[in-house]
């Protein structure tokens, strides 16, 4: 149409200038378009250089939009992580504060002379919660063994108790149950509660990490071409008012984000497992009940030891022989038997209930994040045509878009008419992130059954071990020595998204 040859390029000039490009590149009127590499080769207002600039710009705009969407999700996960982490830390700190406030009055020297052992126990629990590769059952067993030796000595200052005698006491301890049921109850409940708490918080960390890493995956050249065609070719071809057809936009973005959509199944599995593990936050083995009440088991244990003192001593002497009397030692002092401490639990304040409710709702909202991403970006960022009619931009001209919308994921892009996708070459970063999601899901499933995946039989298939990016230093794969507290490595941030200072919170 000869009349169209002289059509002005004013609208394109306006758009191109608004993008910050030099207006000297823009022709005054349409020119023949044989030079175009991406847009259809009709009469055009775009030079080769303009086409290249707009292609780069559309690519950058899509990456920005993608990063923005990811940032919103990351921020939500980071906020959740921080809220739960603060709450769990607060529970443990509260328990330790209660112990420090009530034990001196209740147990006198039985506590004050062993305050360090109690402080160390809370430190170990904190380390364990934050992802250190401690064996919780061993940690607790060693705490009770050390405590028994020290308390037995304190209860019998008139006796000489050399190391070999204390070793014998230790061997008898399991059968004698000097602390009553408290150690067993604490072991069972603490294992379940701490495993649930730490795996949930790690799950939030891994999810956030996956989103961050996937947002950095570059979009390929085929995607750049398709997005340019989708967004700017209408301007170049003199139909600047035509908005992209919705289905056309979806096909372009489904092709561009094919690898990301493959995260969907494992992402859903992870989020489902996280919602499920919150069921373990309630009851007498629940997070609030256990983490906030460690001191109550410790109180019950010392109460039991005092109650059982005479029977215990008789049985120890029967099993280990008569210890020598300490000539320098005082006589048995009845004043060491203190009054009992009535254990008070931290009543549920509703904080955890609120956190769980909000987390469940938000995790439900983002379950289909990866597969809904093309639709979300099209509707929010691409100024789509409001109707699938014959007035929208279909990539060639203003008109109806006829091809069907592709399915989700890489395999479904084999016949994508808009983006040439090599379905035999999945993106390796995304494959690695799928694996991290799988690993974290296995960890959560194990935690749901009360098992700590780090300490399951090494003969397992191993698919559940390792924490992916749930730990940001090597503590998750290192057992921390508990024999000497001076040899412990300080934990900075075994949970993602927390700063070094937060990693060393204490009461």
């Amino acid at each position: 149409d000869p009349a169209s040859k002289s059509r002005s390029c004013g609208e394109v000039r306006q758009i191109y200038g608004a993008k910050g490009f030099s207006l000297s590149d823009v022709p005054q009127a349409e020119i023949s378009g044989e030079h175009l590499r991406i847009c259809p080769q009709g009469y055009t207002c775009c030079t080769s250089e303009m086409e290249e600039n707009l292609a780069n710009r559309s690519h950058a705009e899509l990456e920005t939009a993608l990063r923005d969407s990811s940032r919103v999700l990351q921020a939500m996960l980071a906020t959740q992580l921080r809220s739960f982490d603060d709450h769990f830390q607060h529970l443990l700190n509260d328990s330790e504060r209660t112990l420090q406030a009530t034990f001196p009055g209740a147990f006198g020297e039985l506590y004050t002379q062993n305050a360090r052992a109690f402080r160390d126990l809370y430190s170990e629990l904190r380390l364990y919660y934050r992802g250190a590769n401690l064996h919780l059952e061993e940690t607790l067993a060693e705490f009770w063994a050390r405590l028994l030796e020290r308390l037995f000595k304190q209860l019998h200052p008139q006796l000489l108790l050399p190391d070999d005698y204390l070793d014998c006491l230790g061997k008898q301890a399991e059968a004698l149950r000097p602390f009553g049921e408290a150690p067993r109850e604490l072991r069972l409940r603490a294992t379940r509660a701490f495993v649930a708490a730490r795996s949930f918080v790690q799950g939030l960390g891994v999810a956030s990490d996956v989103v961050r890493k996937v947002a950095q995956v570059p979009l390929g050249p085929e995607c750049s071409r398709a997005v340019m065609k989708l967004v700017y070719c209408a301007h170049c071809l003199g139909v600047p008012g035509a908005r992209p057809c919705p289905d056309y936009c979806r096909n372009v973005l489904k092709g561009c984000l094919a690898n990301q959509a493959d995260l969907d199944a494992e992402w859903r599995n992870l989020l489902d497992s996280m919602v499920l593990i919150t069921d373990k936050f309630w009851g007498t083995s629940g997070v609030e009940s256990v983490i906030g009440s460690v001191h109550t088991w410790l109180a019950e244990a010392i109460n039991a030891l005092q109650d059982n003192r005479d029977t215990l001593t008789a049985k120890v002497i029967q099993g280990c022989g008569n210890p020598k009397v300490n000539p320098q030692g005082p006589g048995p002092e009845e004043k060491r038997r203190r009054g009992k401490l009535a254990p008070r639990e931290r009543p549920p304040s509703g904080t955890l209930e609120k956190l769980v409710s909000e987390a469940k709702a938000q995790l439900r909202d983002v379950q289909d994040f990866w597969i809904s991403l093309p639709g979300t970006l099209c509707s929010e960022k691409m100024a789509l045509s409001t109707a699938s009619d014959d007035r929208c931009w279909n990539g060639m001209a203003r008109g109806r878009y006829l091809p069907e919308v592709m399915g989700d994921g890489l395999a479904n892009q084999i016949n994508n008419p808009e983006v040439e996708v090599d379905i035999t070459k999945p993106d390796m970063t995304i494959r690695q992130q799928i694996m991290q999601l799988k690993i974290m899901t296995n960890r959560l499933r194990s935690a749901y059954n009360g098992n700590d995946v780090d300490f399951q039989d090494a003969s397992d298939d191993g698919s559940g071990s390792g924490s992916g990016d749930g730990c940001l230093d090597d503590l998750c794969s290192r057992k921390v020595s508990r024999k000497s507290s001076s040899s412990r490595t300080p934990l900075t941030h075994a949970l993602p998204g927390l700063s070094e200072q937060e990693g060393q919170k204490t009461s």
Partner: antibody, heavy 119, light 107 residues
Framework: QVQLQQPGPELVKPGASVKMSCKAS????????MNWVKQSHGKSLEWIGR????????SYNQKFKGKATLTVDKSLSTAYMQLNSLTSEDSAVYYC????????????WGQGTSVTVSS | DIQMTQSPASLSASVGETVTITCRAS??????LAWYQQKQGKSPQLLVY???TLAEGVSSRFSGSGSGTQFSLKINSLQPEDFGSYYC?????????FGGGTKLEIK
Amino acid sequence: QVQLQQPGPELVKPGASVKMSCKASGYTFTDYYMNWVKQSHGKSLEWIGRVNPSNGGTSYNQKFKGKATLTVDKSLSTAYMQLNSLTSEDSAVYYCARSGENYYAMDYWGQGTSVTVSS
Amino acid sequence: DIQMTQSPASLSASVGETVTITCRASENIYSYLAWYQQKQGKSPQLLVYNGKTLAEGVSSRFSGSGSGTQFSLKINSLQPEDFGSYYCQNHYGVPWTFGGGTKLEIK
């Protein structure tokens, strides 16, 4: 099956104390909280407090602090509630009720012990 | 403390009818609400917890809904054994509080 057995009615004098029991069977006693709930004649229900049988830890409704004391005997799978300085206001049916993993809702209840305070 | 207001205080209905009881919390309790049924001279029985989860062994004629501050219990196709008193209970933060109750009588 889960059962919470409570003793029959109690008639007590004003100013006295009463200790009632709740014997649990059919489940692991230490795995569930034991709650105590008051129901005055023809009235609604009031939560008194709960005890964690695994460690004896207690949480009370502020209104009943000093009035009720909750304890357990693990070896007998039995929870106890002692009410002291009784007045006619304390005449009511007292229920024990188990709560656990159902977000702390009370899924099994005892048949209740009726306490009448009268001189 | 969180106040729980139940309505109506009493209602009469016939076998086969559908009835709805409502419960309002004085502040947001999310989904943490339970419903109990109590028959004359008996102890309460859990029907629904967490707003809408049916307790074990409870007939599917009962259904709970709502969250935040407004909740309801719906009983479809009333049966003779459904008559009695119904209580809602917040199980959000202690002290756990109950509604005043709704007495459901046969018309």
